[in-house]
Interface confidence: medium
């Protein structure tokens, strides 16, 4: 299809080389009730339609994204050629940063009502640059946490070094929806609830003598509880003795509950005590078996190929630790009688 009639928007993504970062493009098609842009060309080239972020109007809920190769080749369907770019409804998610994401992206509805309709489409010219070290050293992270039940704030990473007074007007989106009220580089959340979690996008306009660009940053916001004040507790094994059959294989499971910590470095390991000696056992990797807002249950097994007489004299100790402290539970094997 002919893309010369597409409206054009220029975006700039300045990514930090220090952190993982995502990016999004919205299919900024006009809402049907607010513009005639998607109908037969009633607009002269000088008339600019009113462009509003896509809000999921029924007739525009299914869009197709393309990339325009710089060498003039035909448009490429995003889904077929770019595994690091994911389409979710009307939003294009870039999972990894890099200058190779620079280029022209075109979106249009899949359902074109009639062949006479001018292709209703938007062309987004994306420029991707790494952040220079001269930029702000303490810019806000692209991953921000809000503490449930308290007051918090979400900062626009690309503007977090500027004071509120010198900051340009910012447009914010949450999960693709315009937050019409928020206009500054920092959103104050009066009281944090779990519904504040999500993907926030902040946009502001940067102009030079030639043209203007929308500078965009994406913030993943997580709602969290306060860090635990407790050391982990061992849920299993509960008993300090375990009946076993000699010569048979044996798996002993250690399950421990760790309270939430923003910086989470759980330790769960098995070691063996034999008279005065003790040594750590190389056992299968620990795995998370349940994770909630407040805590996480982690399991790690010790596997004995076959229980020997010597094992009956040993103590098998599960050791768990977080930043607050550690807990141990020892198990003595006992031969099954009869």
């Amino acid at each position: 299809f002919n893309i010369s009639g597409c409206s054009t928007k220029k975006l700039l993504w300045t990514y930090s080389t220090r952190s993982e970062e995502e990016f999004v493009l919205f299919c900024d098609l006009p809402e049907p009730q607010k513009s005639h842009f998607c109908h037969r060309n009633r607009l002269s080239p000088k008339q600019v339609p009113e462009h509003l972020p896509f809000m999921g109007s029924n007739d525009l809920s299914d869009v197709q994204w393309y990339q325009q190769p710089s060498n003039g080749d035909p448009l490429e369907d995003i889904r077929k050629s770019y595994p690091h770019i994911i389409q979710d409804k009307c939003t294009l998610h870039f999972l990894t940063p890099g200058v190779n994401n620079s280029g022209s992206y075109i979106c249009r509805p899949k359902m074109i009502k009639s062949p006479y309709d001018v292709a209703c489409c938007v062309k987004m010219i994306l420029e991707v640059k790494p952040q220079t070290n001269a930029s702000c050293e303490y810019s806000a992270s692209h991953k921000q946490d809000l503490l449930l039940g308290s007051t918090g704030s979400i900062s626009c990473p690309s503007l977090s070094c500027q004071s509120d007074a010198q900051s340009p007007a910012v447009t914010w989106y949450k999960n693709g929806k315009l937050l019409s009220v928020e206009r500054s580089n920092r959103i104050v959340v009066d009281e944090v609830y779990d519904y504040h979690q999500g993907t926030y996008v902040c946009d502001y306009t940067q102009s030079d003598t030639v043209s203007s660009w929308t500078v965009r940053a994406v913030v993943q916001v997580r709602t969290i509880v306060g860090d635990t004040k407790l050391k982990p507790d061992i849920l299993d094994p509960v008993e300090d003795t375990l009946e076993v059959e000699l010569g048979k294989p044996l798996t002993i499971s250690c399950k421990a509950r760790f309270g939430f910590e923003r910086v989470f470095n759980p330790v769960i390991k098995w070691y063996i005590k034999d008279s005065d000696l003790e040594w750590e056992v190389s056992v299968p990797e620990a795995k998370s078996i349940k994770s909630t807002l407040k805590d996480e249950i982690i399991e790690r097994n010790i596997i004995l190929e076959k229980v020997t007489q010597r094992d009956l004299r040993r103590k098998f100790v599960c050791f768990v630790q977080n930043s607050i402290g550690n807990t141990t539970q020892s198990v003595q094997l006992k031969e099954k009688r009869g």
């Epitope: 019409s180 959340v189 609830y193």
Partner: antibody, heavy 121, light 111 residues
Framework: QEQLEESGGDLVKPGASLTLTCTAS?????????ICWVRQAPGKGLEWIAC????????TYYASWAKGRFTISKTSSTTVTLQMTSLTAADTATYFC?????????????WGPGTLVTVSS | DVVMTQTPASVSEPVGGTVTIKCQAS??????LAWYQQKPGQPPKLLIY???KLASGVSSRFSGSGYGTEFTLTLSDLECADAATYYC?????????????FGGGTEVVVK
Amino acid sequence: QEQLEESGGDLVKPGASLTLTCTASGFSFNGNYYICWVRQAPGKGLEWIACIYAGSSGSTYYASWAKGRFTISKTSSTTVTLQMTSLTAADTATYFCVRDKPAGGSSYTLWGPGTLVTVSS
Amino acid sequence: DVVMTQTPASVSEPVGGTVTIKCQASEDIESYLAWYQQKPGQPPKLLIYQASKLASGVSSRFSGSGYGTEFTLTLSDLECADAATYYCQCTLYGVNFVPNVFGGGTEVVVK
């Protein structure tokens, strides 16, 4: 019983300033509430003026027409004020103090009886 | 600010009848809409919050529906005591849900 009461309504001349006070009883303005002011001109509809968050952020929100001329403040754990400047006859109304709870459905669950402000020369 | 357009401005129905009041928001407010009843000389009383949830102590004859930009309040089996002015109200859509703009009101006359 939780109650709100407005005071400070008066007859004033155009161009004057006036401060209205909202006093809580049975609860304090330290929780996660929005305390807001709404007005109603005689025989007319309800008009939202401003809100303040009673929690730690103290965030304030204003109707676009009220910015600059009206100021909402929390003055104590049981009082919120509305300062009004450059009053005109169009500001003649009953002013209500109302309370909301952010997660409680985003609506005004508690209203004061109102205080009358008359601006006339 | 969002603009809330309420229709009709006035409606008259007999006892036992049904009244439907509509409220249209100038932008998508999801389900953040409340309905109030006001009688002369009294402050308004909350009837419905979050578009369809009945406030505590309110008769089930009142019901609310809608989402996005179109909302409806229905009063069924009208009683004389339902004669009042009814207002819709939206909520500021940001990260903080602050109730704000009201519709123009609908006067309900019960014959």
